[in-house]
């Protein structure tokens, strides 16, 4: 029950996160005009990944797309790429996780397959969240750098006679949406990975016999673990995912309640 809840919650959290990443990517307010000493402005500038906008105080808003690809800063292109990769991975992760949900029965899908799919989607969510966080952080860093550069030469004089105020940009709403969404996707992914451990079936229901060889302390269990030689087939026991890699001695140190000598 706890596993189902963890998996379901992980799915919902990731879904919200990915929706947020999509929203952030589409938003125009990645950077907004800094109203440092002028809280009320007649012309307000803000920029997104795809277009820049100007909102006039009279109500008129005009947005212009970045119709050039080669003329854009490499950093902006990198942020776009990170956000798109995050969305694509997240979308695939969502698709995979739908089929992996324990509460949904699809034909005769085995728990081991669901566990694998849960783990796959979890990893995808984690990478998706990291991509979004990285993208937003790169953009934020770019803004901070530009902010201090424009502060250094805030007023560029024309022969010392006329002042031209340089527009400074600060963090827009999309950055915060992106950070939160990326974090949620990451958390959702971790939850899916945790749920995956619980989805892995218990040790085989068949009684496993331990054969103790005279000079060795190795337990041979049919299907208990996959030997590197390829023996110990899993087809009947449905045991694919093991909580972690363990040595043969470690396996022997955790005997099943069905073991007998």
């Amino acid at each position: 029950m706890a596993v189902t809840a963890c998996q379901g919650l992980g799915f919902v959290v990731s879904l919200i996160g990915i929706a947020g990443i999509i929203a952030a990517t589409c938003m125009d307010q990645w950077s907004t005009q800094d109203l440092y000493n002028n809280p009320v402005t007649a012309v307000f500038n803000y920029q997104g990944l795809w277009r820049s906008c100007v909102r006039e105080s009279s109500g008129f808003t005009e947005c212009r797309g970045y119709f050039t690809l080669l003329g854009l800063p490499a950093m902006l292109q990198a942020v776009r790429a990170l956000m798109i990769v995050g969305i694509v991975l997240g979308a695939i992760g969502l698709l995979v996780s739908i089929f992996a949900l324990k509460c949904i029965r699809i034909g005769s899908m085995e728990d081991s397959a669901k566990a694998n799919m849960t783990l796959t989607s979890g990893i995808m969510f984690i990478v998706s969240g990291l991509c979004a966080i990285a993208g937003v952080s790169v953009f934020a860093n770019m803004l901070v750098t530009n902010f201090w550069m424009s502060t250094a030469n805030m007023y560029t004089g024309m022969g010392g006679m006329v002042q031209t105020v340089q527009t400074r940009y600060t963090f827009g709403a999309a950055l915060f949406v992106g950070w939160v969404a990326g974090g949620l996707t990451l958390i959702g992914g971790v939850m899916m990975c945790i749920a995956c451990r619980g989805l892995a079936p218990e040790e085989t229901n068949y009684k496993a016999v331990s054969y103790h060889a005279s000079g060795h302390s190795v337990a041979y269990k049919p299907g208990g673990f996959k030997a590197s030689t390829g023996f110990g087939s899993n087809t009947k026991n449905k045991k694919i995912y093991d909580g972690g890699a363990r040595t043969e001695d470690e396996v022997q140190s955790y005997p099943s309640k069905h073991d007998y000598v």
Epitope: Q33, T41, A42, N45, Q47, C53, V54, E56, S58
Partner: antibody, heavy 118, light 113 residues
Framework: QVQLQESGPGLVKPSETLSLTCTVS?????????WNWIRQPPGKGLEWIGY???????NYNPSLKSRVTISRDTSKNQFSLKLSSVTAADTAVYYC???????????WGQGTLVTVSS | DIVMTQSPDSLAVSLGERATINCKSS????????????LAWYQQKPGQPPKLLIY???TRESGVPDRFSGSGSGTDFTLTISSLQAEDVAVYYC?????????FGQGTKVEIK
Amino acid sequence: QVQLQESGPGLVKPSETLSLTCTVSGYSITSNYAWNWIRQPPGKGLEWIGYINYSGNTNYNPSLKSRVTISRDTSKNQFSLKLSSVTAADTAVYYCATSYYGNSFIYWGQGTLVTVSS
Amino acid sequence: DIVMTQSPDSLAVSLGERATINCKSSQSLLNSGNQKNYLAWYQQKPGQPPKLLIYWASTRESGVPDRFSGSGSGTDFTLTISSLQAEDVAVYYCQQAYSFPWTFGQGTKVEIK
């Protein structure tokens, strides 16, 4: 077509409050645009007083801010100007106007002359 | 406040001749976000409210004859009437809309010589 019409008393006594109303037809004042008041003393230039925009936010000329209030009545599709403690220097033709693209004044009322005199 | 200074104060031009009015602002009116200059030109005839001719320094308002044109960027702007007509006799004002409070030039009176 947006039409604006100013109305109010043509004569106001010094130290009293000047009150004018602009009735808008052909457009809802809550849809878009900023709704401005501009004045022009006889034989002189234009001075922007302030505005109330479609969302109800106001902005005033700092030189008049302490004396000016611009409000609106959405049910009547009107906006109003109140200028307190008037003096003879406030004698002018008062225009209501709509600003939009480029923050430029695209539609104007015919104007109403307000004289401040005892 | 941004101060708008128009020159000349009055201008007498023969019918069919070119009339040029200048407007200078104390600060740049160019917005970096859209590369537009927030300057408008108005025409006011006696007893009438002003009429918008040009906005964004060079965009002609619909219905305005094409003999009216605006140019300039930053702090220096020009309104040109390419061929003066009798109905163009009026006072012309420039207005900055980039920074509050919005301010007007003192006006230029255009007459027929």
